[in-house]
Amino acid sequence: LRLLDHRALVCSQPGLNCTVKNSTCLDDSWIHPRNLTPSSPKDLQIQLHFAHTQQGDLFPVAHIEWTLQTDASILYLEGAELSVLQLNTNERLCVRFEFLSKLRHHHRRWRFTFSHFVVDPDQEYEVTVHHLPKPIPDGDPNHQSKNFLVPDCEHARMKVTTPCMSSGSLWDPNITVETLEAHQLRVSFTLWNESTHYQILLTSFPHMENHSCFEHMHHIPAPRPEEFHQRSNVTLTLRNLKGCCRHQVQIQPFFSSCLNDCLRHSATVSCPEMPDTPEPIPDYMPLW
């Protein structure tokens, strides 16, 4: 988890002087509770936006937006803590909006936004906005949270982001798998425009079962430049096991931008359809 760039982050708006600060996610008001605390955020919205860095890279970011409730507690609102928790790693990153002037009610509802948390493809986050100071131990909670899942690199809009392109999202191998005679598979795929090696991982399964009955790995050396974007054809020999008929072929590239952590593509060959046993035709037709 990180913030997009380190350019000046702005939270000021007409009628409010505000600064964005790094936060330890442990606001002082936890340790030194205040008697009067503000109410919780209203209408918290989390959206996926895309933002360019100063270097021109494109990253997915969490766009966080919320409004204030129209009650008197606005007079005691000193700021907000924005927290993003990545659920699979338990990593948390926080920033603090510090209000340098007192808020006053005005003709329209106060609205705040922040779009600088960089999020990763196919990751789930819990986004929390906490109004500050935080409540006393038995006080009503004054935060709002939402869980938010970022699409993976297969998604059309994600595919062109820098983290996805770095993991090989623009490569479409267009895999075809053909069953040959004598227990063989012919695998064909399109090479990318990089002189790097590939690995074909074959896993076979019995019909309707998920534990493998055969595994095989095939190494493909790095292509020469004249072979870029050409089809590569490989014939794999299967183990002659009756019923070991469903084959999953996975192609793992080793591009320089992602090494052994590149996006893999796969194709599956189903077991052949069992022909229905035909009804025996009777020798004679009964008359009744």
Partner: nanobody
Framework: QVQLVESGGGLVQPGRSLRLSCAAS????????MHWVRQAPGKGLEWVSG????????DYVDTVKGRFTISRDNAKNSLYLQMNSLRAEDTALYYC????????????????????WGQGTMVTVSS
């Protein structure tokens, strides 16, 4: 124009099944997470189920888990809700809704982030 149209509602006996459909048009359906939300007579909106853009993640409110199944067919721009073992308390107007953003908001606090709603289809469970 951008719209969602639900169908498949009706009167059904307890324990029976219904399949709701939602036809989407006017936007890139396969980019967005989709949801089902219901409103029982005289009650507020209740989020029922959600599905990510590629069906990779699905979620349900606890009261329908194991009975309802959400699915989608991106080639047909369609969202579905298979409802089995229906109960009287499932009686409601069922809406399909599109997520405003490309991400997928998970759980019951998400309804305020939906920007397109259908007109709803009524499901009545009664003997």
């Amino acid at each position: 124009q951008v719209q969602l149209v639900e169908s498949g509602g009706g009167l059904v006996q307890p324990g029976r099944s219904l399949r709701l459909s939602c036809a989407a048009s006017g936007f890139s359906f396969d980019d967005y997470a989709m949801h089902w939300v219901r409103q029982a007579p005289g009650k507020g909106l209740e989020w029922v189920s959600g599905i990510s853009w590629n069906s990779g993640r699905v979620d349900y409110v606890d009261t329908v888990k194991g009975r309802f199944t959400i699915s989608r067919d991106n080639a047909k721009n369609s969202l579905y809700l298979q409802m089995n073992s229906l109960r009287a308390e499932d009686t409601a107007l069922y809406y399909c809704a599109k997520e405003r953003s490309l991400g997928y908001c998970r759980g019951g606090s998400c309804s305020d982030g939906f920007d397109i709603w259908g007109q709803g289809t009524m499901v009545t469970v009664s003997s």
